[in-house]
């Protein structure tokens, strides 16, 4: 009498995640009677992956119809396949009894499932920073296999080379994870930069996934101050110009202080943007001379994205002869600043 | 699922050729294809790939002699001064399902000949 | 670039015997290889890929393995349909590069 056969004809089989994959199982006998079982792995904590008798096994199915008589192909096919199903599948003849007893195992299937990767998610600091200042970027990746990838940093489509890079596990896994940070220096011009991470993979059709995350959510760019006094006019009023230039972002409050004591605020709003994507602003402030005795000190005081307030003062000198007033004068662009206006 | 090239000629060293790969059955937009070349009695040799979305990849001794390109069913191949040592079968190819390590679906092949 | 070396370059074999070529990459590949075979005017065919994973359609006879640089296709018993050039091919996941081998004419005996 002829042994039986438990033949699975693939040593191993790859599908792609959400794909079916088949796994063929013929025995070359019908007998002895008795069932077949299909197992994940070997030895006492093997998982029972399909029993045509018993239990529900949704993504399974026969492939050819396993109730006909004379039936020899036990091959099933797994639907909607994941990392998760990786694994060595065994086909295993059982001889009919109380209980049935395992007769003869096949030589099993090595089922590779191939993953693409997310899409890469790119998260910037918590907090905005200056020129100069280095911020770091992250990127992650998840489910992908096999365990082989490509991460790269581009900043303004510049290779980006203070990178550290990790992919988990470090061991055989059914899917990996990919972490990086990359850190950048920041400059002035930054606002409209942006750093890309692209990751790319053998599921991949050829283009790297990209992840984005622009600049301007990073930085902060102070502004620069100026304060002007413009031609003393024939009503005796002096126009006083304060500019507030190559700031981001808009975030902005400005405040008007006569000898010390708050004269106007306002807000920054819906402000033209410069091509570098700063902002300026100009806020001018009328000063009656005439109603002053003694020189009038002048502040414009800045509080830029919540940060603490940068200061530009000077005095305006009360003259008796006002029609000698200079045109145009500014205070110096540095610290607080007093100047006399004559 | 089937490729088709064409194209292949007689042509004069320095005047540009362009091979066409035409597929039937699958979606260009889905697959990054290849072009291979084979010069006579010799080996396989990798010229290039055109991604999914339409970028092009290529061998780093190509150096600009070729172009790849592709429409919504046709993939080209411009060769953009031939000379006599680009005589060869020309083949176009498609990526596998499970990722572009291996090329499972071949077109017979274009033969061109570059000869003064 | 990666260099792929197979060999032998050509071998004679008669049907039934057991076939085995090798290839060698010049640095790590992991497992991106693929063998295909050409018969004269024709284009090539997928038989391998992924080092090891029988193409669908591919007569069982045909394996592969290795991983790393070293890689092995065996036919375990030669037909006569089997006679024809075997070729293998990498894909550099870092470089996304494809090379293939030179070649081996498998000739009757």
């Known amino acids: 009498e002829e042994e039986l056969q438990v033949i699975q004809p693939e040593k191993s089989v790859s599908v792609a995640a959400g794909d079916s994959a088949t796994l063929n199982c013929t025995v070359s006998s019908l007998i002895p009677v008795g069932p077949i079982q299909w197992f994940r792995g070997a030895g006492p904590g093997r998982e029972l992956i399909y029993n045509l008798k018993e239990g529900h096994f949704p993504r399974v199915t026969p492939v050819s119809d396993p109730t006909k008589r004379n039936n020899m192909d036990f091959s099933i096919r797994i639907s909607n396949i994941t990392p998760a199903d990786a694994g060595t599948y065994y086909c295993v003849k059982f001889r009919k009894g109380s209980p049935d007893v395992e007769l003869k195992s096949g030589a099993g299937t090595e089922l590779s499932v191939r993953a693409k990767p997310s899409a890469p998610v790119v998260s910037g600091p918590a907090v905005r920073a200056t020129a100069e200042h280095t911020v770091s970027f992250t990127c992650e990746s998840h489910g992908f296999s096999p365990r082989d990838i490509t991460l790269k940093w581009f900043k303004n489509g510049n290779e980006l080379s203070d990178v550290q890079t990790n992919v988990d596990p470090a061991g055989k896994s059914v899917s990996y994870s990919i972490r990086s940070t990359a850190r950048v220096v920041l400059t002035r011009r930054d606002v409209h930069s942006q750093v890309i991470c692209e990751v790319a993979h053998v599921t991949l059709q050829g283009d790297p996934l990209r992840g984005t995350a622009n600049l301007s959510e990073a930085i902060r760019v102070p502004p620069f101050l100026e304060v002007t006094q413009q031609s003393m006019r024939a009503d005796n009023q002096v126009n006083v110009t304060c500019q507030v230039t190559k700031f981001y972002p808009q975030r902005l409050q400005l405040t008007w202080l006569e000898n010390g004591n708050v004269s106007r605020t306002e807000m920054a709003s819906a402000l033209p943007e410069n091509k570098d994507g700063t902002y300026n602003w100009t806020s001018w402030l009328l000063v009656n001379v005439s109603a002053h005795r003694d020189d009038v000190k002048l502040t414009c005081q800045v509080e830029h994205d919540g940060q603490p307030a940068v200061n530009k003062s000077f005095s305006v000198k009360v003259s008796a002869h006002p029609k000698e007033q200079g045109s145009n004068t500014a205070a110096e662009n540095t610290g607080t600043n007093e100047r006399n206006i004559y | 699922v089937q490729l088709v090239e064409s194209g292949g000629r007689l042509g004069q060293p320095g005047t540009s050729l362009t091979l066409s790969c035409t597929v039937s059955?699958?979606?260009?937009?889905?697959?990054?294809m290849g072009w291979f070349r084979q010069a006579p009695g010799k080996g396989l040799e990798y010229i290039g790939i055109i991604s999914s979305s339409g970028s092009p990849y290529y061998a780093s001794w190509v150096n600009g002699r070729f172009t790849i390109s592709k429409t919504s069913t046709t993939m080209d191949l411009k060769m953009n001064s031939p000379t006599t040592e680009d005589t060869a079968t020309y083949f176009c190819a498609r990526v596998g399902p499970l990722g572009v390590d291996y090329f499972n679906i071949w077109g017979p092949g274009t033969l061109v000949t570059v000869s003064s | 670039d990666i260099q792929m070396t197979q060999s032998p370059s050509s071998l004679s074999a008669s049907v039934g015997d057991r076939v085995t070529i090798t290839c060698r990459a010049s640095q790590s590949i992991n497992s991106y290889l693929a063998w295909y075979q050409q018969k004269p005017g024709k284009a090539p065919k997928l038989l391998i890929y992924?080092?090891?994973f029988l193409y669908s359609g591919v007569p069982s006879r045909f394996s592969g393995s290795g991983s790393g640089t070293d890689f092995t296709l065996t036919i375990s018993s030669l037909q006569p349909e089997d006679f024809a050039t075997y070729y293998c091919q990498s894909w550099h996941y870092i470089s996304r590069s494809y090379t293939f081998g030179q070649g081996t004419k498998v000739e009757i005996k």
């Open positions: 059955g699958f979606s260009l937009s889905s697959y990054v």
């Open positions: 992924s080092a090891s």
